[in-house]
Interface confidence: medium
C-alpha cells in the first residue's frame, strides 16, 4: 500500500482551522492478523530522508496522536489532552485520514508528516509516510482562508518501506 | 511522567513457574506494545515477544515459545509474563518496555531479576 | 533470523576522542536503533530510525548507516558515555539486538 498527500501545501491565515490530510491507497488487507497505526508529526527536510525527525505538534508527540484500528475502519482522537491542544486527528471508512488544527499561529508553520504502519502479527511492520507544508501568514498579504496547493503525481505518493 | 514498575526479585526452583508484572503510568497503555527482553549476565539482550494492549495481539520470538506467556490487564494498565518449566537457563534480569509502532523501546521498566536454583 | 554483529566487542578511548563503532546485518534492514547501558541499569534509547537523536540525548552522539551495515559514533569521548551499546533491528521478526560494544574510558 501507499500513502498519498493529496496536497503538498497549506497556506493560510492565522487563527483559521486547517485539515491537514493523507490518504491510503492500494490494497488494504482486512484480515484479523492486520492493524493499522496511523500518527502526525512535525519533521524537517533531511538531506537525506523527508519525515525522518519526528517532532512534536504543539507539545503533542506523534505517540499522543495516534489512531489504531484494523482494514478502513473509522476512527477519531478522543483524547482530552489532544483537543486542549487544538488537534484532532481522524481516519475514515476510505482510507482518508487528517489532522485538524484550530486557531492556527505563526508558530504551526512547517513540515507536517502523517505515518502508517501496517502491522501483521508474527511476521513483520511495514511504515509508509507522507508529508506537507503548512505555511501561515500574518498580515495584508495573509489570505482571507486555507489556500490549499494540489501535489503533484510524482509528489503524492510518499513511500517508506520498513 | 511515564514509568514502568516491574514486580521485585525472585528465587525459584527448577520445574516451577512464575509470573512478572509491568504497571504502565502517565501514557496511554493501548497506543503502545509491552515488549519483554531477556538479559543474561549482565550482556546479550535478547527479545522475547510483545503484546497488544490495544486488541491483545501477541508476537513472540519462536526461541521463546512455550517458555514465555504474555498477558495485560487493561484495568490496571498491567503487563504480565509468566515464565513456565524453569530452568538455571532462564535465571536473567527481564525488562519490559514500551514501543510506538514503527519506532524503538523509548521507555524501560527497571528490570526482574529471576534466579532459578535448588 | 537477522543477526546482528557488532565490533569491536570492547574499545576504551580518551576524554575528547573521537569514537565509533559499527554494526552489521545478516540480511538487509531498513532502519537501526541503538541502546546505551550502564551497569545495574536499565538499557536507553540513543537512536532511532538510523540517525535520529531520542529525546535529551547530547549531540555528540549520531548514527549512520543504511542495507547492512551501521554505525555510532560519539564525536568528543566524555567519561559519562563509558557503556555498553547495543544495535537493534526492528524490521523482521524476531527482533534482534547485536551482541553489545563496552566502551570504557582511558
Known amino acids: 500500500f501507499k500513502v498519498a498527500t493529496p496536497y503538498s501545501l497549506y497556506v493560510c491565515p492565522e487563527g483559521q482551522n486547517v485539515t491537514l490530510t493523507c490518504r491510503l491507497l492500494g490494497p488494504v488487507d482486512k484480515g484479523h492478523d492486520v492493524t493499522f497505526y496511523k500518527t502526525w508529526y512535525r519533521s524537517s527536510r533531511g538531506e537525506v530522508q523527508t519525515c525522518s525527525e519526528r517532532r512534536p505538534i504543539r507539545n503533542l508527540t506523534f505517540q499522543d496522536l495516534h489512531l489504531h484500528h484494523g482494514g478502513h475502519q473509522a476512527a477519531n482522537t478522543s483524547h482530552d489532552l489532544a483537543q486542549r491542544h487544538g488537534l484532532e486527528s481522524a481516519s475514515d471508512h476510505h482510507g482518508n485520514f487528517s489532522i485538524t488544527m484550530r486557531n492556527l499561529t505563526l508558530l504551526d508553520s512547517g513540515l507536517y508528516c502523517c505515518l502508517v504502519v501496517e502491522i501483521r502479527h508474527h511476521h513483520s511492520e511495514h511504515r509508509v509516510h507522507g508529508a506537507m507544508e503548512l505555511q501561515v501568514q500574518t498580515g495584508k498579504d495573509a489570505p482571507s482562508n486555507c489556500v490549499v496547493y494540489p501535489s503533484s503525481s510524482q509528489d503524492s505518493e510518499n513511500i517508506t518501506a520498513a | 511522567e511515564v514509568q514502568l514498575q516491574q514486580s521485585g526479585p525472585e528465587l525459584v526452583k527448577p520445574g516451577a513457574s512464575m509470573k512478572i508484572s509491568c504497571k504502565a503510568s502517565g501514557f496511554s497503555f493501548t497506543g503502545y506494545t509491552m515488549n519483554w527482553v531477556k538479559q543474561s549476565h549482565g550482556k546479550n539482550l535478547e527479545w522475547i515477544g510483545l503484546?497488544?494492549?490495544?486488541?491483545?495481539?501477541?508476537s513472540y520470538n519462536q526461541k521463546f515459545k512455550g517458555k514465555a506467556t504474555l498477558t495485560v490487564d487493561k484495568s490496571s494498565s498491567t503487563a504480565y509474563m509468566e515464565l513456565l518449566s524453569l530452568t538455571s537457563e532462564d535465571s536473567a534480569v527481564y525488562y519490559c518496555?514500551?514501543?510506538?509502532?514503527?519506532?524503538?523501546?523509548?521507555?524501560w521498566g527497571q528490570g526482574t531479576s529471576v534466579t532459578v536454583s535448588s | 533470523q537477522i543477526v546482528l554483529t557488532q565490533s569491536p566487542a570492547i574499545m576504551s578511548a580518551s576524554p575528547g576522542e573521537k569514537v565509533t563503532m559499527t554494526c552489521s546485518a545478516s540480511s538487509s534492514v531498513s532502519y537501526m536503533f541503538w541502546y546505551q547501558q550502564k551497569p545495574g541499569s536499565s538499557p536507553r534509547l540513543l537512536i532511532y530510525?538510523?540517525?535520529n537523536l531520542a529525546s535529551g540525548v547530547p549531540l555528540r552522539f549520531s548514527g549512520s548507516g543504511s542495507g547492512t551495515s551501521y554505525s555510532l559514533t560519539i564525536s568528543r569521548m566524555e567519561a559519562e558515555d563509558a557503556a555498553t551499546y547495543y544495535c537493534q533491528q526492528w524490521s523482521s521478526y524476531p527482533f534482534t539486538f547485536g551482541s553489545g560494544t563496552k566502551l570504557e574510558i582511558k
Open positions: 518496555a514500551r514501543r510506538a509502532y514503527g519506532y524503538a523501546m523509548d521507555y
Open positions: 503484546i497488544s494492549p490495544y486488541n491483545g495481539g501477541t
Open positions: 530510525d538510523t540517525s
